[in-house]
Interface confidence: medium
């Protein structure tokens, strides 16, 4: 069976002028997934991103996340790229900044 992920992008304020954008994929199966941030359509290098483990979410499906820091005002240059079971998609940064606990 294949269950496509639900992808959600959120922003959290880190410090003045900088924000952390987090891309979360949830409720997907099987567990193999590619989740990465792109800037100007190009994947960011690994040293500028942080990934969460792919974990079971208790419903027989999985969840994970990837985060990166960006400068406020440049949100439109960033998208979260997801690839899962032959399907892929890009998800833009909304621009809404939420006050969330940072993964960094």
């Amino acid at each position: 069976r294949t269950v496509p992920p639900m992808v959600n992008v959120t922003c959290s304020e880190v410090s003045e002028g900088n924000i952390t954008v987090t891309c979360r994929a949830s409720s997907f199966y099987p567990r193999n997934i590619t989740l990465t941030w792109r800037q100007d359509g190009v994947s960011l290098s690994h040293n500028t991103q942080q990934w969460g483990d792919v974990l079971p979410d208790g419903n027989g499906t999985y969840q994970t996340w990837v985060a990166t820091r960006i400068r406020q005002g440049e949100e439109q240059r960033f998208t979260c790229y997801m690839e899962h079971s032959g399907n892929h998609g890009t998800h833009p940064v909304s621009g809404k900044v939420l006050v969330l606990q940072s993964h960094w």
Epitope: V14, G17, N18, R38, Q39, D40, G41, V42, S43, L44, S45, N47, T48, T68, R69, I70, R71, E74, R77
Partner: antibody
Framework: QVQLVESGGGLVKPGGSLRLSCAAS????????MSWIRQAPGKGLEWVSY????????YYADSVKGRFTISRDNAKNSLYLQMNSLRAEDTAVYYC??????????????WGQGTLVTVSS | DIVMTQSPLSLPVTPGEPASISCRSS???????????LYWFLQKPGQSPQILIY???NLASGVPDRFSGSGSGTAFTLKISRVEAEDVGVYYC?????????FGPGTKLEIK
């Protein structure tokens, strides 16, 4: 080995048009962002335009915005620069370059040999 | 736009001697991801430019280790520990932080 070969340069009158091409080989072209950089005779380097691997992100220098159009054909491993309303100050050698500043190690790590565009009446 | 300046604009050097080129940016090139988006290129006479240093201090593949890059957010230095005849050409710094990408005016290194 990696090769970028520009073509399409030449002499054109002010107000005229030219289309530059860059043929890429030796690497997976569709994975690379590309940029055009130009160099006026005896002068320094000037970034002109950027296009992402899928063509969904495009940027231009203010000096060419509205006159130049960058595009790519991944099936043909080719990059293009359509130049309209040319001015004398557009006279330069135009270089096609790969652009990998986000991914891996480099920024502009491969450059073509350049093609000369001369705008003169 | 971010303005890049370089000094000196001309640099005569004796082979075997060290050389140093300075580059400054009008705005910090340190990104919040902790990378500094400053690059050095060399354009040898009659050739296309080639990359020397990426992200301020990383030596590009195939570049001799006599080249090194250092700096802070707005002030950068390219050093050649021992200049060789093949090092002649124009050295450019470039900011790759934001559009439009901008280059310094170039420093012409020549052999005395």
């Amino acid at each position: 080995q990696v090769q970028l070969v520009e073509s399409g340069g030449g002499l054109v009158k002010p107000g005229g048009s030219l289309r530059l091409s860059c043929a890429a080989s030796g690497f997976t072209f569709s994975n690379y962002a590309m940029s055009w950089i130009r160099q006026a005779p005896g002068k320094g380097l000037e970034w002109v335009s950027y296009i992402s691997p899928g063509g969904d992100y495009i940027y231009y220098a203010d000096s060419v915005k509205g006159r130049f159009t960058i595009s790519r054909d991944n099936a043909k491993n080719s990059l293009y620069l359509q130049m309209n309303s040319l001015r004398a100050e557009d006279t330069a050698v135009y270089y096609c370059t790969t652009d990998r500043r986000h991914y891996g190690s480099y920024a502009m790590d491969y450059w073509g040999q350049g093609t000369l565009v001369t705008v003169s009446s | 736009d971010i303005v890049m300046t370089q000094s000196p604009l001309s640099l005569p050097v004796t082979p075997g001697e060290p050389a140093s080129i300075s580059c400054r940016s009008s705005k910090s090139l340190l990104h919040s991801n902790l990378n500094t988006y400053l690059y050095w290129f060399l354009q040898k006479p009659g050739q296309s430019p080639q990359i020397l240093i990426y992200r301020m201090s990383n030596l590009a593949s195939g570049v001799p280790d006599r080249f090194s890059g250092s700096g802070s957010g707005t002030a950068f230095t390219l050093k050649i520990s021992r200049v060789e005849a093949e090092d002649v050409g124009v050295y450019y710094c470039m900011q790759h932080l934001e559009y439009p990408f901008t280059f310094g005016p170039g420093t012409k290194l020549e052999i005395k």
